[in-house]
């Protein structure tokens, strides 16, 4: 339905505290280096002309499209230029390359300082006195860092986020109620951040039909006594609300989801038993609850899918005649009845049942050609089951911290290339999959570990996109986005790297590390232990274990030295000198 | 979890008929597919006949339809196998297993439980 003015119909259906909110969020995602004040600014003259058109949607350029209105207001940044450099010729193109163009200079990791959180008493302070602009800066500081975060749900973050404040800076400990919840919000957001850059890397690097087979397999497992057409329906509108997303249409996108998450609770009995209670919650709270909601049961019959896709004489026909439907209810079918399959397993297989028809359809007896089709799912439902069970099995033996340092050096020696801070990142948030998934039970480890999996090896996708220094991460990243992880699981030690010439600078310490946390000391030595094995690729676990033992005890002994800057100088030589002949540098 | 323990094997002429029995013990079965396979001397394992959670589909191997019947009762925790016309073919050690998630029924791969096996031979 056309709308005269469409920037005064998201200012009607969105109310101004979320319109101005999501205008903060769109502004910070695209000029991510600008000044908090200097997008306040531009975000409080969109508003002010968005008044103006819902008082009288006639007025000028109220007919304007959203794309114009922001990129022009973009685009009277006095410093476009200097701060971004080639960005600033977007602003000679016209809608609807001039978005493109900005949306290509997203920046996945973007040159800011890392935040540090101030003291209790400070933020507590700062929210008693402007609290309106405080969860301003939230916004804007959290839009920046993460250009792809799913607006809608930072929308509710700093819901969650203002609460937390509101409830613990009148508390008698403000640090002890305060301090967890905002941990707890920091790893949240990062991951929630992490899954929307997984759905926006699907939908515009491999398209919308990869998205909405993916979005096919996971609603049709959560979702498995919905028919498939109401499955499909849920599909087309969530591709919506995400191609709007990942394309910075936030008005239309958060408008859009409050539209979807309606439909499912005035639906939910042909949908799901479970939603009940996320159906009761405030639009905020619903839609997150919804989209968190756990799988329902499964009927309680469900025939073999052999009679429809293997034994029927049917099957090439209703194939031809609507390939992507037939397969659609394929993957629906199967994955109403895998709940512990992950949904890149079930897209392998649905992949590999296309594969057969489409080489099947075209012999002399096609029958005859995809009868046994499924006996080429096994080895593909074993790899990840198998791959996951001694992963496991590492993990409970090692623990976290060295279970990391495994994947660590397994990774380094995969795509030594890679810069060491994205190797450890992403290293370790592998490692997290341990305490994450292999305390599930079986039926539950798979959809768990491989899905996160894919996650996390598209932040390595993304990052590497930035700078490409590794044809084999720009191999497994664009090939198939399905077969990402199977492709890295599959990588051997790169024969072709040159070991990275010997700095001592490198493996130099000083006393500053006896302050910080233990997930930044870990993080010190996770970087060491990466260039590690970027000067000694061939180095065994045995030797690095060796070096890493005594790289812990001289920071241990460091630490607890009168005079700890002469110790880490002195000590320091040492530990290098006799790294590297144990090394054999 | 489920155990699987299977009788009612043993030794039958051509033509004839036997009736094996899986009991379970442990986790109620109506939210197991369940299903018998086979195992021939020398041979891989191969799929015979499943039956859905409640009874309602049930689903063979082209080699023993209209001879064999699989049925289940879940308030007795049991599945039975009807086998009827037997042929020295059939002659193997049979297996129950019980999966709670399948697609196909027929793959051994989406079963999570297994019995020991009884042994069917058929013979003149």
């Known amino acids: 339905d056309a709308h005269k003015s469409e920037v005064a119909h998201r200012f009607k259906d969105l109310g101004e505290e979320n319109f101005k909110a999501l205008v903060l969020i769109a502004f910070a995602q695209y000029l991510q280096q600008c000044p908090f004040e200097d997008h306040v600014k531009l975000v409080n003259e969109v508003t002010e002309f968005a008044k103006t058109c819902v008082a009288d949607e006639s007025a000028e350029n109220c007919d304007k499209s959203l794309h114009t209105l922001f990129g022009d207001k973009l685009c009277t940044v006095a410093t476009l230029r200097e701060t971004y450099g080639e960005m600033a010729d977007c602003c000679a193109k016209q809608e609807p390359e001039r978005n493109e163009c900005f949306l290509q200079h997203k920046d996945d990791n973007p040159n800011l300082p890392r935040l540090v959180r101030p003291e209790v008493d400070v933020m507590c302070t700062a929210f008693h006195d402007n609290e309106e602009t405080f969860l301003k800066k939230y916004l804007y500081e959290i839009a920046r860092r993460h250009p792809y975060f799913y607006a809608p749900e930072l929308l509710f973050f700093a819901k969650r986020y203002k609460a937390a404040f509101t409830e613990c800076c009148q508390a008698a400990d403000k640090a002890a109620c305060l301090l967890p919840k905002l941990d707890e919000l920091r790893d949240e957001g990062k991951a929630s951040s992490a899954k929307q850059r997984l759905k926006c890397a699907s939908l515009q690097k491999f398209g919308e039909r990869a998205f909405k087979a993916w979005a096919v397999a996971r609603l049709s497992q959560r979702f498995p006594k919905a028919e498939f057409a109401e499955v499909s329906k849920l599909v087309t509108d969530l591709t919506k609300v995400h191609t709007e997303c990942c394309h910075g249409d936030l008005l239309e996108c958060a408008d859009d989801r409050a539209d979807l998450a309606k439909y499912i609770c005035e639906n939910q009995d042909s949908i799901s038993s479970k939603l009940k209670e996320c159906c009761e919650k405030p639009l905020l709270e619903k839609s997150h609850c919804i989209a968190e909601v756990e799988n329902d049961e499964m009927p309680a019959d469900l025939p073999s899918l052999a009679a429809d896709f293997v034994e029927s004489k049917d099957v090439c026909k209703n194939y031809a005649e609507a390939k992507d439907v037939f397969l659609g209810m394929f993957l629906y079918e199967y994955a109403r009845r895998h709940p512990d399959y992950s949904v890149v397993l079930l897209l392998r297989l649905a992949k590999t049942y296309e594969t057969t028809l489409e080489k099947c359809c075209a012999a002399a007896d096609p029958h005859e050609c995809y009868a046994k089709v499924f006996d080429e799912f096994k080895p593909l439902v074993e790899e990840p089951q198998n791959l996951i069970k001694q992963n496991c099995e590492l993990f409970e033996q090692l623990g976290e911290y060295k279970f990391q340092n495994a994947l660590l050096v397994r990774y380094t020696k995969k795509v030594p290339q890679v810069s060491t801070p994205t190797l450890v990142e992403v290293s370790r948030n592998l490692g997290k999959v341990g305490s994450k998934c292999c305390k599930h039970p079986e039926a539950k480890r798979m959809p768990c570990a491989e899905d996160y999996l894919s996650v996390v090896l598209n932040q390595l996708c993304v990052l590497h996109e930035k700078t490409p220094v590794s044809d084999r991460v720009t191999k497994c990243c664009t090939e198939s986005l399905v077969n990402r992880r199977p492709c890295f699981s599959a990588l051997e030690v790169d024969e072709t790297y040159v070991p990275k010439e010997f700095n001592a600078e490198t493996f130099t310490f000083h006393a500053d590390i006896c302050t910080l946390s233990e997930k930044e000391r870990q993080i010190k030595k996770q970087t060491a232990l990466v260039e590690l094995v970027k000067h000694k690729p061939k180095a065994t676990k045995e030797q690095l274990k060796a070096v890493m033992d005594d790289f812990a005890a001289f920071v241990e002994k460091c630490c607890k030295a009168d005079d700890k800057e002469t110790c880490f100088a002195e000590e320091g030589k040492k530990l290098v000198a006799a790294s590297q002949a144990a090394l054999g540098l | 979890d489920v155990q699987l323990v299977e009788s009612g094997g043993g030794v039958v002429q051509p033509g004839g008929s036997l009736r094996l029995s899986c009991a379970a013990s442990g986790s109620t079965i109506s939210s197991y597919v369940m299903g018998w396979f086979r195992q021939a001397p020398g041979k891989e394992r191969e799929f015979v006949a499943a039956?859905?959670?409640?009874?309602?589909?049930?689903y063979y191997a082209d080699s023993v339809k209209g001879r064999f019947t699989i049925s289940r009762d879940n308030s007795k925790k049991t599945v039975y196998l009807q086998m009827n016309s037997l042929r020295p073919e059939d002659t193997a050690l049979y297996y129950c297993a019980a999966g709670r998630y399948s697609a196909w029924y027929s793959q051994s791969y989406e079963y999570d439980y297994w019995g020991q096996g009884t042994l069917v031979t058929v013979s003149s």
């Open positions: 039956i859905s959670r409640s009874g309602g589909y049930t």
